[in-house]
Structures are given as structure tokens and as C-alpha cells.
Amino acid sequence: MAVTACQGLGFVVSLIGIAGIIAATCMDQWSTQDLYNNPVTAVFNYQGLWRSCVRESSGFTECRGYFTLLGLPAMLQAVRALMIVGIVLGAIGLLVSIFALKCIRIGSMEDSAKANMTLTSGIMFIVSGLCAIAGVSVFANMLVTNFWMSTANMYTGMGGMVQTVQTRYTFGAALFVGWVAGGLTLIGGVMMCIACRGLAPEETNYKAVSYHASGHSVAYKPGGFKASTGFGSNTKNKKIYDGGARTEDEVQSYPSKHDYV
């Protein structure tokens, strides 16, 4: 039950995270005009990964796409790539995890297969989350660098008479959406990996257990417990096995082939 809950929760958290990564990637407000030096601007600029926008005094917003590939900064291209990789991995992870869900029965799929799929999707979610966090962080770093560079030469003019305020950009809403979404995807992935360990069946080879009744002294009580009057003398009553059966908690404490997370 706990395993199913962990897996289900991991799936839902990752789903929300990936939806957030998609939303952040599509958002136009990755960087917004810093209003510190001009809080009363009638023209407000903001930029996304795919286009830049200007909101004018009329309330009209004009957005223009970046219709060049080669003319864009390498960092922006890198951020785009990281976000897309994050989305693709996340989408594949979601697809895999749907089939891995314990609550969904698909044919005669074994628990070992579900465990493998859960682990695979978990790893995909972790990498997806890391890609999103990395992408957003690279962009944020780029903004910080540009912000201080533009602050250094903030004002230019003729003899100090005319002020030309250079537009500076600060963190936009998309960055925060991206960080949170990346974090959620990462958490969801970890939860899937944890769930995988609980799903993994023990590879124990149970051999036949033979019970030999010695006379009338042996009685079988309900519940499967064997009672005997002569413990010492009852040498024939042996259970023959390679490994004893363990409780669910004990199962998790033993290493198995899935314990490499």
C-alpha cells in the first residue's frame, strides 16, 4: 500500500512538475524590465526564450519572435536545449510511469517489469528536473551578469545634460515557475525510485517444504502454526529451505538487483 502511494504521489508530483516546465518554457516573462530606475515607464519590456514583448501606454502588447537561429546568443540556445531535453525526457518518463503504476493492470506484466519501468521513469524525471533547473539557472546567471554590466554604464549623455537610461532586465516569473517545476519533477523522480525498491520482488528460490506427522502427537492448529508434544525427539519434522521467508520490512534491508539508486 505504501509503495503504491509513493509511486502514485511520485507520478502526480512529476506530472505537475513537467506541466510547469512546459509552461515555463513557453512563457514570455523569462526576463522583465527592471523598473528601479524608471518606475513610471509607459513602455514595459519583457523577454522569453522564443520572443520579446513590449507593452505600450495604450495597453497593447507587441511580441516579436526571434526569427534567427545563428544570431542568438549561445547561452540562450543552450537554455532552450536544456528545457526541451527536460520536456522530452519528462514526457517519456510520464509515458513509461503510466504503465509502471501498480494500480494499473496491463496483461500479465510482472512486478519485476513494473519495478524496472518505475526506476526508469524515476531516473528520467530526475534528469528532466535537473535539466530544467540547470536551464533556468544558466539564464538567471546570464541576467545577473548583464544586469551588473548595464549598471556599470547605466547613464550616457552629452555633457551630463541628457540622460539615456539603458534598459536593464531582472528575473521574470518564468524563472520561478521553472525552478519550482524542476524541483517538483526531481522530487517526483526520487519518489519513483524509492517506490521501485518496494516493488522489486525478492529473488528467493523456495524449495518444497515437507511436513511429516509423527504419530498422534502432532496437531495442526489454525493459522498455520505447528504444535508438537515432543520437540526434542521430533527430528523428522524439518523444514528444508535455502533462505527463510522475511517480512516486507526485512525484504527492503537486503540488497537486490534494483538497489543501485
Partner: antibody, heavy 115, light 113 residues
């Protein structure tokens, strides 16, 4: 075509208030901010402020804060401006202005403040 | 507030003349976000509302005759009428559309010589 029709001329006593209207047609009213501008005799045009018809958000020229109050009725595609504590200096033609590049102006409402 | 200064305050010209009027702003009206100058020119005739002629310092509004042209960048702008027509005698205003409060120039009155 895009049109702004303003209410008629008003004559008011000092200290009174006046509320003028600006009815928009020919475009989606909530697409653009509605700005208000005044032109006093022999004076340059002065921007009073604007209202965003989507959310009722306003921005005022510091000079007109407390003097002008901007409101909208989106269902009637109408913007309103109320001027309070009128003085003789408030005698002017008041225009509502909208659309992109502030291209469309109303015909103006003349407010005369006289005792 | 951005101060808009227009010169000259009045101009006496004849029909067919070429006219140039200037507008200076106390701060740059250039927006680096879209590489546009947020300066607008209006024409106003007595008893009428102003009429938009030019926006973004040099873009003519649709329906405005091509004899009207705007130029300039940053803080210095000009409006040129290549060949003045009788219907052009009016007052011309420049307006800062870059920063609140939006501000207007004092106007240049075009009169018949």
C-alpha cells in the same frame, strides 16, 4: 469605425464636482487602456491618467491625484472621469483617448467653472 | 517628468513651402527592447481634437499624406512637411509616449504667410 463619443458641455460652480462619460464603439473595449487628457485655454495638453478596462487599474499624473477619479463600465463600453473640488483653473476641454499609439480621441467635453 | 520643448512656437509659410519643426525631450525616448523611439506627432485644428500623424518618431499613421515625415532619435526629433497644403495650417504637437506622466510639447502653430 473606432469612435469615442463624449458627454456634453458642463458649467459648474467652484467647489462642485462633475462626472463626464466617454462611450467607445468599433473595437473591443477591454483591448486598450483609456487615457484622459485636458487642454486648458492657452495651455499645452496635459495627461491626466489612464484606466485599464480589464481590471479597473489606474495610473494618474501626480498633479491630478485627488482631483480626478477614473472608472469604467465594461458592459456599456463606457469610461468615466469625475473631477472634484472644481476651481476656475479646471476650466478646460477634457478628452478621452484610446487604441494603439493613442490614435483615437473623443470630441472633447468642455467644462466651465464659474461663479 | 520628461519635458518636451518645441520650436519654433509659430511658423508663417506659403502653400507649397517645405517646413521643418523640431521637438526636444529632456530624456531619451528610445526603447532598446524594440529599437523604437516613443515620440508621437499630432495635428490640431481650432475647436477639434488632436489627430495622430506620426508614431514611433517616423511611422506615418494610415491615411496620413506622405508629405508628412518624421525623423530623429533619442532626444531630438523633427517633423517635416515637404509641400504645405492649405489644409495643413494648424498647430502641431509632439508627445512623449515613453514615460509617465505622458507629456506634450507646447506646439508649433503653422500660419499662412
Amino acid at each position: 469605425q473606432v469612435q469615442l463619443v463624449q458627454s456634453g458641455a458642463e458649467v459648474k460652480k467652484p467647489g462642485a464636482s462633475v462626472k463626464m462619460s466617454c462611450k467607445a464603439s468599433g473595437y473591443t473595449f477591454t483591448d486598450y487602456n483609456m487615457h484622459w487628457v485636458r487642454q486648458a485655454p492657452g495651455q499645452r495638453l496635459e495627461w491626466i491618467g489612464y484606466i485599464n478596462p480589464n481590471n479597473g487599474g489606474t495610473s494618474y499624473n501626480q498633479k491630478f491625484k485627488g482631483k480626478a477619479t477614473l472608472t469604467v463600465d465594461t458592459s456599456a463600453s463606457t469610461a468615466y472621469m469625475e473631477l472634484s473640488s472644481l476651481r476656475s483653473e479646471d476650466t478646460a476641454v477634457y478628452y478621452c483617448v484610446t487604441t494603439r499609439y493613442l490614435a483615437v480621441w473623443g470630441q472633447g467635453t468642455t467644462v466651465t467653472v464659474s461663479s | 517628468d520628461i519635458v518636451m520643448t518645441q520650436s519654433p512656437s509659430s511658423l508663417s509659410v506659403s502653400v507649397g513651402d517645405r517646413v521643418t519643426m523640431t521637438c526636444k525631450s529632456s530624456q531619451s525616448l528610445f526603447n532598446s527592447g524594440n529599437q523604437k523611439n516613443y515620440l508621437t506627432w499630432y495635428q490640431q485644428k481650432p475647436g477639434k481634437a488632436p489627430k495622430l500623424l506620426i508614431y514611433w518618431a517616423s511611422t506615418r499613421e494610415s491615411g496620413v499624406p506622405d508629405r508628412f515625415s518624421g525623423s530623429g532619435s533619442g532626444t531630438d526629433f523633427t517633423l517635416t512637411i515637404s509641400s504645405v497644403q492649405p489644409e495643413d495650417f494648424a498647430t502641431y504637437f509632439c508627445q512623449n509616449d515613453y514615460s509617465y506622466p505622458l507629456t506634450f510639447g507646447g506646439g508649433t502653430k503653422l500660419e499662412i504667410k
